[in-house]
Interface confidence: medium
């Protein structure tokens, strides 16, 4: 008996060939011997089966001895053994129809779980294997679960259902709702304008929700809400903003925040959350601000950084065009009685400069002694 696998909603063609390449009598019946379709004279006739409105045949191939049955808009319950009667012989074809669907919305938040459920005919024992757009492999039986979705799981999943050494393929598009980056750090000199950007890793026709940026300044004992906003059809409107600092927010996506000045008291970490309409849970992106200040006070030249820096970062004071350098894996470096000239303060990671500030040290002339 030939086995044919079909996909729910698809069209399948069950073939039946006569030995003589000519138009002859044929009938297709189901396992209950109910006639589905056949030929009477030169016309296609349909029987009383449930399939009658979805079954057809390729009339153009009849005179070549091909008497196929086409079933449109397949349903799981179409799974059955179909019998083609032609030239006093019977050909049996077992049709197994499968459906694979995500058991929830296919737009899921990062960290949420995805479950794919296989609909299959009674008595079948299929296996399912799926591959994510990033190459992650999973396999299962009636259900396949991905416990924690990551942003690289966004895209088309390829799933193969196998039964009796036959396979049928499914493609399922999954959208993982997340920011493009989990975390980002902005490095600024004191007084510079700061731009924070929060691009999304997905696009939706209508994007509605609300968000908030909580900030934990390094110098503060507790965090505070810097800004709250609404998102309506990709338009951003500010609801509430602190007086210090006075953040500005762009009206369009990607979410964009401007801090007029980088100051040591603002250095720290923030967490932007975005709650989307009709979705449980929130999207998160961490953002860090590191601020540098270079100062000269009397005979002391100091360079300091504030904010979340990793212990492997190096802070250096360097005299331009000279070898004089002071380097430390610390948040402050200083030089006593610095030579006159242009000094550079550098924050670097394995030789890559992240932040640089220049300060000019003027020569100090000895004060003339009063007679």
């Amino acid at each position: 008996k030939k086995v044919v696998l079909g996909k729910k909603g698809d069209t399948v063609e069950l073939t039946c060939n006569a030995s003589q390449k000519k138009n002859t009598q044929f009938h297709w019946k189901n396992s209950n011997q109910i006639k589905i379709l056949g030929i009477q004279g030169l016309f296609l006739t349909k029987g009383p089966s449930k399939l009658s409105d979805r079954a057809d045949s390729r009339k153009s191939l009849w005179d070549q001895g091909c008497f196929s049955m086409i079933i449109k808009n397949l349903k799981i319950e179409d799974s059955d053994t179909y019998i083609c009667e032609v030239e006093n012989k019977k050909e049996e074809v077992e049709l197994l129809v499968f459906g694979l669907t995500a058991n929830s919305d296919t737009h899921l938040l990062e960290g949420q779980s995805l479950t794919l459920t296989l609909e299959s005919p009674p008595g079948s024992s299929p296996s399912v294997k799926c591959r994510s757009p990033g190459g992650k492999n999973i396999q299962g039986g009636r259900t396949i679960s991905v416990p924690q979705l990551e942003r690289q799981d966004s895209g088309t999943w390829t799933c193969t259902v196998s039964q009796d050494q036959k396979t049928v393929e499914f493609k399922i598009d999954i959208v993982v709702l997340a920011f493009q980056k989990a975390s980002s750090t902005v490095y600024k000199k004191e007084g510079e304008q700061v731009e924070f950007s929060f691009p999304l890793a997905f696009t939706l026709e209508k994007l509605t929700g609300s968000g908030e940026l909580w900030w934990q300044a390094e110098r503060a004992s507790s965090s505070k809400s810097w800004i709250t906003f609404d998102l309506k059809n990709k338009e951003v409107s500010v609801k509430r903003v602190t007086q210090d600092p006075k953040l500005q927010m762009g009206k369009k996506l990607p979410l964009h925040l401007t801090l007029p000045q980088a100051l040591p008291q603002y250095a720290g970490s923030g967490n932007l959350t975005l709650a989307l309409e009709a979705k449980t849970g929130k999207l998160h992106q961490e953002v860090n601000l590191v601020v540098m200040r270079a100062t000269q006070f009397q005979e002391n030249l100091t360079c300091e950084v504030w904010g979340p820096t990793s212990p492997k970062l190096t802070l250096s004071l360097k005299l331009e065009n000279k070898g004089a350098t002071v380097s430390k894996q610390a948040k402050a470096v200083w030089v006593l009685n610095p030579e006159a000239g242009m000094w550079q303060c550098l924050l670097s990671d394995s030789g890559q400069v992240l932040l640089e500030s220049n300060i000019k040290v003027v020569p100090t002339w000895p004060t003339p002694v009063q007679p």
């Epitope: 294997k129 591959r131 990033g134 190459g135 992650k136 492999n137 396999q139 690289q152 088309t156 390829t158 193969t160 196998s162 050494q165 036959k166 396979t167 049928v168 393929e169 493609k171």
Partner: antibody, heavy 117, light 107 residues
Amino acid sequence: EVQLVQSGAEVKKPGESLKISCKGSGYSFTGYWIGWVRQMPGKGLEWMGIIYPGDSDTTYSPSFQGQVTISADKSISTAYLQWSSLKASDTAMYYCARDQLGLFDYWGQGTLVTVSS
Amino acid sequence: DIQMTQSPSSLSASVGDRVTITCRASQGISSWLAWYQQKPEKAPKSLIYSASSLQSGVPSRFSGSGSGTDFTLTISSLQPEDFATYYCQQYDSYPYTFGQGTKLEIK
């Protein structure tokens, strides 16, 4: 019996184009990814990329993206690896393999490509 | 890309010896690791999948273990036909990558 049969050895000049093939039999060709692996003379195995013959979806290793094209013709259960302009450094043995959940469970016999002026 | 590092690069052993080859991934790959055997002028052959599952038809003297970043292939009692080059491969995320190989030679 699952089999992957590759086309024969090729000797080409630099700048020439080439398309080698891999014909699958004994299994549902459209239901498995097919991968290509390079082995340069005396060296190890390098994963080049894969194709899903069901709909010709491809994924390349960044090292080979833009250097080769992987394609398939499901009507004849055949996958292809092609170059538009060969270089001497493309001289290698190329294997196709059936990808079963990422594991290469069945391999072709290999196609030796020699590029020399 | 995930880097796969095999050690040793080459190994001399005698028939009957117990041999262990290790493979380290640059990041966690769960159990998505395969081992292959390749003999000169032949295509590689799959030995182990999912870090520890034996491919059908492969002798039981071959075994695999490990998960996360550290994996081993063990041959409990070397046979003459086992002298070959062995490769590990991760298939946790694209691009799937191979180790550089371990050549097992007769002492």
